[in-house]
């Protein structure tokens, strides 16, 4: 007349080495496993009863140890991976728009000795700022007197009037903004005179894009004469190095 080995629990372990058989009336003591602590008033022992079964322990009296509460960082949020601060869990940090994280994005609640502690210090959310954007030759940008630019602040470049008969063209993005990595969204543009040669075609003629002169991004369309076919593209664009792209087509019989 005996009980078999006592039941095992996730959060508790026997205080003594288990035996294969226990006499009726024999009692075993449990203790909380590492990382768990006792939560009174639940029992922590079990008895081998006359039916040769162990008297049940209705609720586990041990609960996981928890790391201390970490509030939301200023200008950000702390999000628990599965709703509790108990060890083995993770705390994720995100910053509001316009702020970036300094420190670890994830903290882990882990055991150190018998205590549950966070894997590091909570991060902080710092305002995103950009240095003033580059100055450019033959042009300027808005807010040129501002020293510090915040997230999504934008500046717009424009070209100066040219000293000669041909204007400066703005090559690149005219508007750039302060990005979340504290860098500007694009390189500063360039202001320079871009003028393509007059697009002449033999055995054909221009049918669209007429102009006095052909500056940056000017587009010209050609048509062949009767009995000829176009070699190349009928549409060309003046590119930033003052050449036609694709080149001026030819017309052949």
């Amino acid at each position: 007349d005996a009980c078999g080995p006592p039941p095992t629990f996730e959060a508790m372990e026997l205080t003594s080495k288990p035996k294969p058989y226990y006499k009726v009336g024999e009692q075993v003591e449990y203790d909380c496993k590492k990382g768990y602590h006792h939560f009174a008033p639940f029992l922590t022992h079990s008895i081998c009863d006359r039916n040769h079964t162990w008297l049940p322990i209705s609720d586990e009296p041990c609960v996981k140890k928890v790391c201390h509460y970490i509030p939301n960082p200023l200008h950000g949020e702390a999000i628990l991976a599965n709703g509790s601060y108990s060890f083995g869990n993770q705390l994720h940090f995100i910053c509001n728009d316009g702020y970036y994280l300094i420190g670890k994005e994830i903290l882990y609640c882990e055991l150190k000795g018998s205590d549950a502690v966070w894997s590091g210090r909570p991060p902080i959310c710092q305002k995103i700022v950009c240095k003033p954007p580059p100055k450019i030759n033959n042009g300027k940008h808005t807010f040129s007197d501002v020293e510090v630019f915040e997230y999504l602040d934008a500046v717009t470049y424009s070209c100066d009037p040219a000293p000669g008969p041909d204007p400066f063209s703005l090559i690149g993005e005219s508007t750039i903004y302060c990005r979340d990595n504290s860098l500007w969204s694009d390189d500063a543009p360039e202001c320079k005179v871009v003028k393509c040669r007059f697009p002449v075609i033999e055995n054909g003629k221009q049918i669209a894009g007429f102009g006095k002169k052909f500056y940056y991004k000017a587009t010209v369309i050609f048509e062949r004469d009767k009995g000829f076919h176009i070699i190349g593209s009928d549409t060309i664009v003046c590119n930033s190095n003052s050449t036609w792209d694709p080149p001026v087509p030819k017309c052949a019989k």
């Epitope: 040669r197 007059f198 033999e202 003629k205 221009q206 006095k212």
Partner: antibody, heavy 119, light 107 residues
């Protein structure tokens, strides 16, 4: 200022050839195209063709292909036009004129060279 | 090629007059038209390019206008040094072609 100095008058026999010159000064020679224009006595102007000194590319009036050959010598900033197999129809004043970036208007002209074809 | 016609081969005007010289193209030339002046001594000058743009150094009494096939050069206040032959030139299509010229004389 831009100046184009053309060579002096030529008296040539029918069937012969002649080489006219146009020396440019006052600007960067390779920046402008050189055009050649013909004017028969008491007549209007006829465009012969152009040459781009920077890369030696050229365009001719179909009518003058085989009659005129355009060349340049960038070292002396001089443009040349060779006229071949001359006939009395080629008796004319020949002008050189510059145009910028291939834009076909001619802001600066030489004084002209008179070519007379006569036996 | 495109034919350029200057129907008036010569015209007389008095000093101070407003003079208009016409030029028509055998097909539309989309404002790709220039005007030149040739003095009696043979020297040639560009006056107007792209229909109405005044070349630098040209007096403002010269102006150009037109569209499609019909173009004109106007001298608003005729001066003695304007005595010359005036040529139009198209450049929409190769070969570039000139009008036959209009000779301007003083009455």
């Amino acid at each position: 200022q831009v100046q184009l100095q053309q060579s002096g008058p030529e008296l040539v026999k029918p069937g012969a050839s002649v080489k006219l010159s146009c020396k440019a000064s006052g600007y960067t020679f390779t920046n402008y195209d050189i055009n050649w224009v013909k004017q028969r006595p008491g007549q209007g102007l006829e465009w012969i063709g152009w040459i781009y000194p920077r890369d030696g590319s050229f365009k001719y009036n179909e009518k003058f292909k085989g009659k005129a050959t355009l060349t340049v010598d960038t070292s002396s900033s001089t443009a040349y036009m060779d006229l071949h197999s001359l006939t009395s129809e080629d008796s004319a004043v020949f002008f050189c004129a510059v145009s910028e970036d291939g834009y076909p208007w001619f802001p600066y002209w030489g004084q002209g060279t008179l070519v007379t074809v006569s036996a | 090629g495109i034919q350029m016609t200057q129907t008036t081969s010569s015209l007389s005007a008095s000093l101070g007059d407003r003079v208009t010289i016409s030029c028509s193209a055998s097909q539309g030339i989309s404002n790709y038209l220039n005007w030149y002046q040739q003095k009696p001594d043979g020297t040639v000058k560009l006056l107007i390019y792209y229909t109405s743009s005044l070349h630098s150094g040209v007096p403002s009494r010269f102006s150009g206008s037109g569209s499609g096939t019909d173009y004109s050069l106007t001298i608003s206040n005729l001066e003695p040094e304007d005595i010359a032959t005036y040529y139009c030139q198209q450049y929409i299509k190769l070969p570039f072609t000139f009008g036959s010229g209009t000779k301007l004389e003083i009455k």
